[in-house]
Amino acid sequence: SEVEYRAEVGQNAYLPCFYTPAAPGNLVPVCWGKGACPVFECGNVVLRTDERDVNYWTSRYWLNGDFRKGDVSLTIENVTLADSGIYCCRIQIPGIMNDEKFNLKLVIKPAKVTPAPTRQRDFTAAFPRMLTTRGHGPAETQTLGSLPDINLTQISTLANELRDSRLANDLRDSGATIRIG
């Protein structure tokens, strides 16, 4: 059976998953996949760690916590209705059939958009500026509200800056080999 988590379109979704490392630095591989946990591994892998690093992730899927401390909670950035469904967190403990499996059902709700007087305000209300702070643990997403003076170029620049800074953080923290898919 799976447990249910909710997020709104345009927000970041947080899917919690933890394990206790046997000893500091004694990490076990973890995979996150879209779809219920199969008998082995994860189907449709969106992120994977090994004994040392985050060694695979796809765009919009990342670990906001410190996986070296056993926090392998998944953050899905800027969710859409298509992100709804079951996700598998699999802690790949050595030994036969020792894996811990968690099936998490993500339910995406349509964004609550407040009608605004101008077309420009409609756009910024529907796409508020999102800042995600890097933190070890549950994702903190702050919506700063409507920014009436922002234009499409600025939004695109902001999105790229956020993405680049996150990748820089992840690179610094994990030394991962990156595949952005």
Partner: antibody, heavy 117, light 107 residues
Framework: EVQLQQSGAELVKPGASVKLSCTAS????????LHWVKQRTEQGLEWIGR????????KYGPKFQGKATITADTSSNTAFLQLSSLTSEDTAVYFC??????????WGQGTTLTVSS | DIQMNQSPSSLSASLGDTITITCHVS??????LSWYQQKPGNIPKLLIY???NLHTGVTSRFSGSGAGTGFTLTISSLQPEDIATYYC?????????FGGGTKLEIK
Amino acid sequence: EVQLQQSGAELVKPGASVKLSCTASDFNIKDYYLHWVKQRTEQGLEWIGRIDPDDGETKYGPKFQGKATITADTSSNTAFLQLSSLTSEDTAVYFCSRSNPYYFDYWGQGTTLTVSS
Amino acid sequence: DIQMNQSPSSLSASLGDTITITCHVSQNINVWLSWYQQKPGNIPKLLIYKASNLHTGVTSRFSGSGAGTGFTLTISSLQPEDIATYYCQQGQNYPYTFGGGTKLEIK
């Protein structure tokens, strides 16, 4: 043996600040989150916040934003809790604890803080 | 913030009894719940983590169950040394939160 050794009892005046310490032995604080928890006399446990000593990143409970500052010194394997603008409401026992990663497996012995003129 | 509603706030039971303490959580936390025992004048001590896992060195008379929003701590064959206050705690989301506590007394 894993231990968290906290600093001694404090008696301070209203409006002042105080800094409590928590020194870990038998483990490296960089490998764990360190938390502070408040307990007033005959009352329950309140989570103040935590630090990741590895990079200094902190989280605080909403009630303690602006009141508490958590820091760590990895060279001495010690975490600190600074409380400012003290009032009688801050009179309590303060515990440090280690999480692994979402539950508290070891606790310090507690530091009693009394705020009184 | 996630609210933790622990009940009862106090209870009195006889030696040898089996007692149950419940913790109701305001939103789904899967199994990321722990139970602690605090004896008078002492520090809290971890009993159960991940809703049902017994911490090292804790007697098997303690057991935990539940997932999602409803959790229980069961103490079987009550002993004098079980006199304490028991707390639940969620570790899924910041800020971490504790239940209000259940004070256990022996009749």
